[in-house]
């Protein structure tokens, strides 16, 4: 189920899958929600620790049991991912942090009159992930009203420093507030060039596009279909970026499909989940559980309810069925995508709907537990 | 909203505008989206006009002047006024609207979290009221959704300010001693939301107040936590499955 309580003065021991710097616990929780394996997180505010390297540390954690031992740590905040929390799942983060400088690659500097204007500029710049703004009262006069647009390899700051008269925040592109607009077109038999930021396996170009949309550095993609000439590259989804923000070149290529991230769309973003079921397809991955269920839809529901499950295969092989029920293989991987995709099998595959934000749980009570 | 500022797109995605279409169409009250098919508002919004077919509910909008004859709206399937609300009394000012068709959630149209039943322990320090209501007592409906940050006031303090009224435990008050910031005409039914641990929760429903933003006259809101049993009971679908599940 959806667990929204936060634990103050508590830190989860072990289970680390990733770490990063975030300005507060809520942003850390959001990163946990969108991380394929993260179930729990712990955050160390600046006030909670003297070690400068660990200040603003956000630690993403996984656990086979869904829980980890909590240790007392003054000022620390821990909690759960919001996977399975329906409409509370959003990559949109509007908060502006006063007295905080979020470090990254500064690629654009301009003078603006307010922090809101700086955030707007970041939102309207295709490469900007976060920003810092030096206020009118910043100690160095030449930097006052400077708006620094930034990015980093992981989409989160490379460091966060406490600094007076500086305000920082994130791009509002995930809030569907970009003025850039987006290309909805999918280009058949076309491959984009430029830098690959990640490689995943997907059953089609639409899943590839959604993954690109929610990847911090993906601006466009190329997908190699299941009939691509090189077998080892079939179903490969290449997430790409470039200096300019658009592909520098494209090559006509049979059995490839290319397109753009939809993060810059105005007013509508795709849901961060994939609801389609793929008949005759087997998704390979680490086995989480095998259960007998009646029908592929029930298999998908079972996967969705089991929070660690990322994708599933429902087998229709006679040896995998008992009366009306057949085996439902619940699986996971390091990156949330299948480790292999096989065709021509007797069965169907699909993804967990744990990140779909259509759930109707409005009674989202947050209990804050102190220790 | 008196003393407020313009909201931005998607800032309050649960806010809806309840409008009446007679000869002309006008905004009458606010409301809060709490589920795909449910809006929570004030019972008094329907005083004298309980006919569901004259109402139009606009969600996912920021600027009322953007509404045209082509703007999609929701219609009402059912108005559920609290059984203890009486036009002759000021208590239990709460109503549920069941929409004819469920709404899809987007960044601009999604529900607000409800508090836990009888939530009295949480100390809310970051509360906001939103609406398209008047910006002064002798004002007009605003085009752009307004927002204002207002502190909660204890019921004891509120009762002192309204000695002629009974401020019950099922009400919550908000306002500044010096006035200047408050809800006003046209904001009724809309949300009083508070952010706690990064999550927005619907703490109150805009109900009443003497004048608007007057010194030592806080706004009075229906306390949502006190009506959680009622909300959950009424939003149960006919097959008994809750439309809004309380998470584990």
């Amino acid at each position: 189920g959806c667990l929204t309580q936060l634990y103050e003065n508590a830190f989860f021991r072990g289970g680390d899958v990733a770490s990063m710097y975030t300005p507060n616990a809520q942003y850390c929780q959001m990163r946990c929600t969108f991380h394929p394996r993260c179930l729990l997180f712990s955050f160390l505010p600046a006030s909670s620790i003297n070690d400068m390297e660990k200040r603003f540390g956000c630690f993403l954690k996984d656990s086979v049991t869904g829980t980890l031992p909590k240790v007392h740590r003054t000022g620390a905040v821990s909690g759960h991912s919001l996977k399975q929390c329906g409409h509370q799942i959003s990559a949109c983060h509007r908060d502006i942090y006063k007295g905080v400088d979020m470090r990254g690659v500064n690629f654009n500097v301009s003078k603006v009159s307010s922090v809101e204007e700086c955030q707007k500029r970041c939102t309207s710049n295709i490469r900007c992930q976060f920003f810092s703004y030096a206020t009118q009262t910043f100690h160095k006069a030449e930097y006052r009203n400077n708006c620094l647009l930034k990015y980093s390899p992981g989409g989160t700051p490379t460091a966060i420093k406490v600094l007076s008269n500086v305000e920082s925040g994130f791009s509002l592109k995930p809030c569907a507030l970009s003025e850039i607009g987006c290309h909805m077109n999918i280009f058949q038999h076309l491959a984009f060039s430029d830098v690959d930021v990640a490689r995943v396996l997907t059953p089609d170009a639409f899943v590839c596009r959604t993954i690109c949309t929610y990847h911090p550095n993906c601006l466009f993609f190329t997908f190699y279909t299941n009939v691509w000439k090189i077998e080892s590259q079939r179903n490969v989804c290449l997430l790409k970026t470039s200096e300019s923000g658009t592909p520098s070149s494209s090559t006509p290529q049979e059995n490839t499909i290319s397109g753009y991230s939809l993060l810059t769309c105005k007013r509508t973003l795709p849901e961060p989940c994939h609801s389609k079921i793929y008949p005759g397809v087997d998704f390979g991955g680490e086995e989480l559980n095998v259960t007998f269920v009646k029908g592929v839809n029930v298999c998908q529901e079972t996967c969705t309810k089991m929070i660690r499950c990322q994708f599933f295969t429902y087998s229709l092989l006679p040896e995998d069925c008992k009366e009306e029920k057949c085996k439902c293989f619940l699986r996971l991987s390091m990156d949330g995508s299948p480790t292999r995709i096989a065709y021509g099998t007797q069965g169907s595959s699909g993804y967990s709907l744990r990140l779909c934000n259509t759930g109707d749980n409005s009674v989202c009570t947050t209990k804050t537990s102190t220790r | 909203i008196v003393g407020g500022t313009n909201s931005s797109w998607g800032e309050w995605p649960w806010q809806v505008s309840l409008q009446v279409k007679l000869t002309a169409q006008r905004h009458l009250c606010g409301g809060s989206l709490i589920g795909h098919q449910w809006v929570l508002t004030a019972a008094h919004c329907f005083d004298g006009l309980p006919l569901q077919d004259v109402w139009r509910i606009y969600s996912g909008i920021l600027n009322l002047s953007d509404i045209t004859k082509d703007t999609p709206f929701s219609q009402i399937k059912e108005i559920i006024i609290h059984q203890n609300y009486k036009v002759s009394e000021g208590n239990h000012d709460i109503a549920l609207i069941k929409l004819q068709a469920p709404l899809n959630y987007t960044e601009f149209q999604k529900p607000i979290c409800l508090p836990s039943k009888g939530d009295t322990s949480t100390i809310y320090t970051n509360c906001w009221v939103t609406g398209w209501g008047f910006s002064k007592e002798k004002g007009e409906i605003q085009n752009i959704l307004q927002k204002v940050n207002i502190p909660l006031v204890t019921n004891e303090e509120c009762q002192k300010r309204y000695q002629d009224y009974k401020i019950t435990q099922r009400m919550v008050c908000a306002g500044y001693k010096e006035g200047g910031k408050d809800a006003c005409k046209g904001d009724s039914g809309g949300p009083l939301v508070c952010k706690h641990n990064g999550m927005w929760r619907l703490v109150g429903i805009t109900s009443w107040g003497e004048g608007c933003a007057r010194r030592e006259q806080p706004g009075v809101y229906t306390k949502v936590a006190e009506y959680m049993d009622w909300i959950l009971e009424k939003t149960q679908s006919s097959d008994g499955k809750a439309q809004m599940q309380s998470p584990a």
Partner: antibody, heavy 124, light 106 residues
Framework: EVQLLESGGGLVQPGGSLRLSCAAS????????MNWVRQAPGKSLEWVSS????????NYADSVKGRFTISRDNSKNTLYLQMNSLRAEDTAVYYC?????????????????WGLGTMVTVSS | DIQMTQSPSSLSASVGDRVTITCRAS??????LNWYQHKPGKAPKLLIY???NLQFGVPSRFSGSGYGTDFTLTISSLQPEDFATYHC????????FGGGTKVEIK
Amino acid sequence: EVQLLESGGGLVQPGGSLRLSCAASGFTFSFYNMNWVRQAPGKSLEWVSSISPSGGETNYADSVKGRFTISRDNSKNTLYLQMNSLRAEDTAVYYCARGGGAYRNNWWGGFDIWGLGTMVTVSS
Amino acid sequence: DIQMTQSPSSLSASVGDRVTITCRASQSISVYLNWYQHKPGKAPKLLIYGASNLQFGVPSRFSGSGYGTDFTLTISSLQPEDFATYHCQQTFSLFTFGGGTKVEIK
């Protein structure tokens, strides 16, 4: 049913006093501004006085200021108009009318509920 | 004090006629203008509030318009029950009624 019923009118000599009452039913009396409006024979309507929901704020037309006092008893759902130093020009039908309320919906401004009126005649 | 001037003071019309009554304020009153219908021996009835908003239960042949200082009440097609006196009222600064317009049968 929403209703206002005035009483207390009658014949009074110039310089005399009279107290009008208005009994309200069918609505949250304590949430509404209440008003007295009069109509002298052959004349238009004239607003006389208003009172806020809690009774803390009162207003009067210049023609009655210092002579008339508006008050209310919310526990009895009753509005009053104490009229002293009455003059011949105060002769009129006196109406009690409901004004805008404390509720924050957008149904504002007008006097939407009226009583049938009570006749006050000031004559020697 | 705000003065309200209503015109005409009386008019004669027939059933089915379009009738227009105007009201002018001595200073801007935004949309704070109401229209009432008053019949002898009866309570006045609110028709229009906020210059153009039709009060619930009032027939749609009545409409109001205007902003600031000049306002109009229109009866699109006069019915037998519409013969009465009509009053405008400002509520911007305390309350003032206009002098009334008597609508009589021609």
